[in-house]
Interface confidence: medium
């Protein structure tokens, strides 16, 4: 026997108060399958976090970072503080990279200098904190 | 006992007016998030317009923005839609019900009224 919830469209939820009716989603919320009971409530982009898609009725909101910020986790839980190129973030805000490490975004850590010796070769260029050593022949 | 009773509705011709209400006995509409949705003559159900968050936020399909307007007044416990320049798609039976946040993170309305036709018609 078919459930008669499986015909209720994405957008919509099975209403069990009224004889398994489909019933709309109220606002702020949405259903992206078919045959669901509830509808899900809508993810909110406030503070550090700006709307990047609107929910609707069938598709949850998506949100990104305000300028400064960068996104972290699936689908961006988390905004993370920018730095500048040549620093990481540190507990106590952005640093500057040690000498003989590098970070050429605006995120994520130093890194150290590529060591080109380990190649047999030598160093064409040298590393700053913002760019990693060039290595030649 | 928890109940919703729509009134208001009517005939009226293209362009005109209607107020419907919404008496709710058995709860406060003033601390619950409560709306309005239609069923059009062989169509399915559409929402038409709520307030959420204690009456902070209002709410309008796109189908009604600028024409209907949902208020309430807490002393008589009694939901209001005004419609303005109704048109011939704005025929169908209007509901008032509550939007019910569950514990699992579900939402859905209940407590329906019996409904309230509206027939926009020359």
């Known amino acids: 026997l078919q459930d008669p919830c499986s015909n209720c469209p994405a957008g919509t939820f099975c209403d069990n108060n009224r004889n398994q009716i489909c019933s709309p989603c109220p606002p702020n919320s949405f259903s992206s399958a078919g045959g669901q009971r509830t509808c899900d409530i809508c993810r909110q982009c406030k503070g550090v976090f700006r709307t990047r898609k609107e929910c609707s009725s069938t598709s949850n909101a998506e949100c990104d970072c305000t300028p400064g910020f960068h996104c972290l986790g699936a689908g961006c839980s988390m905004c993370e503080q920018d730095c500048k190129q040549g620093q990481e973030l540190t507990k106590k805000g952005c640093k500057d990279c040690c000498f003989g490490t590098f970070n050429d975004q605006k995120r994520g850590i130093c890194r150290p200098w590529t060591n080109c010796s380990l190649d047999g070769k030598s160093v064409l260029v040298n590393g700053t904190k913002e760019r990693d050593v060039v290595c030649g022949p | 006992e928890v109940q919703l009773l729509e009134s208001g509705g009517g005939l009226v011709q293209p362009g005109g007016s209607l107020r419907l209400s919404c008496a709710a006995s058995g709860f406060m509409l003033s601390a619950e998030d409560v709306g309005w949705v239609r069923q059009a003559p062989g169509k399915g159900l559409e929402w038409v317009s709520a307030i959420l968050d204690f009456g902070g936020s209002t709410y309008y399909a796109d189908s009604v923005k600028g024409r209907f307007t949902i208020s309430r007044d807490n002393s008589k416990n009694t939901l209001y839609l005004q419609m303005n320049s109704l048109r011939a798609e704005d025929t169908a039976v209007y509901y008032c019900?509550?939007?019910?946040?569950?514990?699992?993170?579900?939402?859905?309305?209940?407590?329906w009224g019996q409904g309230t036709l509206v027939t926009v018609s020359s």
């Open positions: 019900a509550r939007v019910v946040y569950h514990a699992g993170g579900g939402v859905t309305f209940d407590y």
